[in-house]
């Protein structure tokens, strides 16, 4: 009698290897015979595709290589004809070893950076990655993990995090390892010993030393107001990655020296520069004109402090002007990392308008000189306690560096606005800012001896600087 | 790119006033830093300066012509002028209008290419 | 007016080195510039603030100045240097000189 058909085992969870033969099976009782067709994922699987074997008529559907993409719902239909289609599905897992499809290479990073080895898996079940450092399995911290992808990540890279790294992908088919690979951590060149400023008697000799360090170890260079100094008179040493180099001189006139440390990232350098002056005791430079030109302020230290759309003078007695100048704020303007939050940026304001003077619209370049006033409120009441501070040290000879010597107005020597209102210079000023906290206080709210000046907007107008300063 | 450009009388008699024109363009005559120069060149001999005006408009002169030098400007016109007096053969020269700026130590970094002027009767 | 002393003539041979000096009272305290004229054009500006080349000169243009000589260096002289030379400072008063002017001839 003709019977409708019935699956007498329905299909289950198959799971196989790739590479390995995996198998579903349909039993039909029906009479007729039925037709069992093959779906996966609910598309037809057809009797040709030369990667099944359909047996046993249509009963048995074997895949002869499995492969990770044949994963899927697998369905079989029988239908004779007699009543309904019926249908049973299951699921095909693919198994898989542990695989490193996109392991980690060697990486060179800067300190301070973000570094992150690859290490990409497949497999089934998902394996976990883990990470060896040299012998031994790698410790999470605040500043390294294993990121969902299985990379490495670590945060603010230090000099300690270099070595050889490997990662591990495991499951319960087996565990598969990366090659070795090398993280080399750069640092930026850095001036562990600053030379130190010398006054001394004409035809002394000076050594001038200057220490750095970073990874590659640096070379040093020194300049001599500008200009290159021959190797001849300088001995350097390399020592567990810092470099100690002096410099020999025969004084017969003041200079600047800088000594510059460099070192290269790849197609990159970074550069670390510190700068003494050597000075002559009794030395009277025979005066000379205003020689110079004048620029766009190029530098950095004082980018926030000059106005921006003016020139200033560039004074070509230094061989490189802008350097030499940019160098002679730099050296002040960490001595004033130091001072009170009041006389800093009223100092920094000063300093960089004395050093980088505005240049006179005039028919020949010449420099503005800051107007009396504003050098004396500066001096009198912004850092009254740090300038007495400072000119005691200078008269009894204690300051470390006599480059403030060179940075440093006589405010007496200034012109008065009062004379001609256009032969001096003002400090840059802005109209008091509640979000820029680096303010003047008001003029007006204290009663200097110095004839502050009247700022051009109204009387609760303050002085204000805001600077930004990054150098390496 | 500033350029600039002299002209005026090829041609001027003596005891007369010889006047040129100097036209500015791809920059204005009253920007700072900026100043505007009369030099020139007697035939077979070198440069020689006669004076200048500044963005502002204050003119100076070479000491040795100042009694008959005069320059002056025309800024709607962005053009410099120079008068000068009781002309003589000596005064014959090619005439030069150039820039002075003080971004190369107030050199003159720009010039016309200058206007023959004879004085002759 | 302040007094700018060049000697007339130089010669140089193709390649060598040119000097060209100019003489004046501690010159060395003051700003020297140097134009180049060939025949029949306009000065052109090769060096500035004694030393400093504007862009588009080559760097075989160099300056110095010192004491009271400036100096106009030409290193390897080519052909195409061949021309007038001629200093100029400006004085305190806002008056500028020029020096006589040296003719370089390229052997």
């Known amino acids: 009698l003709p019977k409708a058909p019935v699956i007498t085992t329905p299909l289950e969870t198959v799971d196989a290897l790739v590479e390995e033969v995996a198998t579903f099976m349909c039993a039909v009782e029906s009479y007729p015979q039925p037709e069992i067709s093959w779906t996966r994922n609910k598309i037809l699987i057809k009797l040709f595709d030369t990667r099944y074997s359909i047996r046993e008529n249509g009963q048995l559907l074997t895949i002869l290589s499995v492969e990770d993409s044949d994963d899927g719902i697998y369905c079989c239909t029988a239908n004779n004809g007699v009543g309904g289609a019926v249908e049973s599905c299951g699921a095909l897992q693919v198994k898989m070893k542990p695989k490193i499809t996109r392991p980690p290479i060697n990486v060179k990073i800067i300190e301070g950076l973000k570094a992150v080895l690859p290490c990409t898996t497949m497999g089934n079940p998902k394996p976990s990655v883990s990470w060896i450092k040299g012998d031994s399995p790698l410790r999470e911290n605040s500043r390294t993990a294993v990121l969902e992808s299985g990379s490495l990540r670590i945060h603010n890279v230090q000099k300690e995090d270099a070595g050889q790294y490997r990662c591990v992908a495991k499951n319960s088919l087996g565990t598969a390892y990366s090659k070795v690979v090398k993280l080399e951590v750069e640092v930026f060149a850095r001036i562990l010993r600053a030379p130190e400023s010398h006054n001394v008697t004409f035809g002394s000799f000076v050594t001038l030393h200057c220490t750095a360090t970073g990874i590659p170890v640096p070379t040093i260079t020194w300049i001599e107001n500008g200009n290159a100094v021959s190797s001849g008179s300088i001995q350097e040493s390399v020592k567990d990655r810092v470099i100690d180099s002096r410099l020999q001189l025969f004084i017969t006139k003041p200079g600047l020296y800088t000594c510059i440390a460099t070192n290269k990232h790849g197609e990159k350098f970074s550069t670390a520069k510190a700068a003494a002056t050597v000075s002559i005791a009794e030395w009277s430079k025979p005066q000379k004109d205003n020689k110079g030109y004048c620029a766009q302020y190029r530098g950095e230290v004082c980018n926030a402090v000059l106005a921006k759309d003016a020139l200033v003078f560039l004074n070509t007695s230094y061989a490189d002007p802008e350097e030499a100048q940019e160098l002679l704020v730099h050296t002040a303007w960490n001595e004033l990392k130091v001072v009170s939050p009041l006389c800093r940026p009223a100092a920094e304001a000063l300093l960089c308008n004395h050093v980088f003077q505005e240049c006179s619209p005039g028919v020949v370049p010449t420099p503005i000189p800051i107007c009396r006033e504003y050098c004396l409120a500066v001096k009198e009441l912004f850092c009254a306690k740090e300038w007495l501070a400072m000119e005691e040290k200078t008269h009894r000879g204690l300051y470390r560096s006599e480059m403030h010597l060179l940075s440093v107005p006589e405010c007496s020597k200034l012109p008065s606005m009062h004379w001609d209102p256009t032969a001096c210079a003002r400090l840059p000023h802005l109209d008091y800012n509640k979000e820029n906290p680096k303010t003047f206080p008001p003029m007006t709210s204290s009663k200097p001896s110095v004839d502050i000046p009247n700022l051009p907007s109204s009387s609760s107008s303050s002085f204000s600087v805001s600077p930004t300063y990054s150098m390496t | 790119q500033v350029q600039v450009q002299e002209s005026g009388p090829g041609l001027v008699k003596p005891s007369q006033t010889l006047s040129l024109t100097c036209t500015v363009s791809?920059?204005?005559?009253?920007?700072?830093?900026?100043?505007w120069s009369w030099i020139r060149q007697p035939p077979g001999k070198g440069l020689e300066w006669m004076g200048v005006?500044?963005?502002?408009?204050?003119?100076y002169y070479s000491p040795s012509l100042k009694s008959r030098t005069s320059i002056s400007r025309d800024t709607s016109k962005n053009q410099f002028s120079l008068h000068l007096s009781s002309v003589t053969p000596d005064d014959t020269a090619v005439y030069y209008c150039?820039?002075?700026?003080?971004?190369?130590?107030?050199?003159?970094?720009?010039w016309g290419q200058g206007t023959q002027v004879t004085v002759s009767s | 007016s302040y007094e700018l002393t060049q000697s007339p003539s130089v010669s140089v041979a193709l390649r060598q080195t040119a000097k060209i000096t100019c003489g004046g009272n501690?010159?060395?305290?003051?700003?020297v510039q140097w134009y180049q004229q060939k025949p029949g054009q306009a000065p052109m500006l090769v060096i500035y603030?004694?030393?400093r080349r504007p862009s588009g000169i080559p760097e075989r243009f160099t300056g110095s100045n010192s004491g009271n000589t400036a100096t106009l260096t030409i290193t390897g002289a080519q052909a195409e240097d061949e021309a007038d030379y001629y200093c100029?400072?400006?004085?305190?008063?806002?008056?500028?000189?020029f020096g006589g002017g040296t003719h370089l001839t390229v052997l």
């Open positions: 150039a820039r002075g700026s003080s971004r190369v130590a107030a050199a003159f970094d720009s």
């Open positions: 791809g920059g204005s005559i009253t920007a700072r830093y900026y100043s």
């Open positions: 005006i500044a963005y502002d408009g204050s003119t």
């Open positions: 501690r010159i060395g305290g003051k700003s």
């Open positions: 603030a004694d030393s």
């Open positions: 100029h400072v400006w004085g305190s008063t806002a008056s500028a000189d």
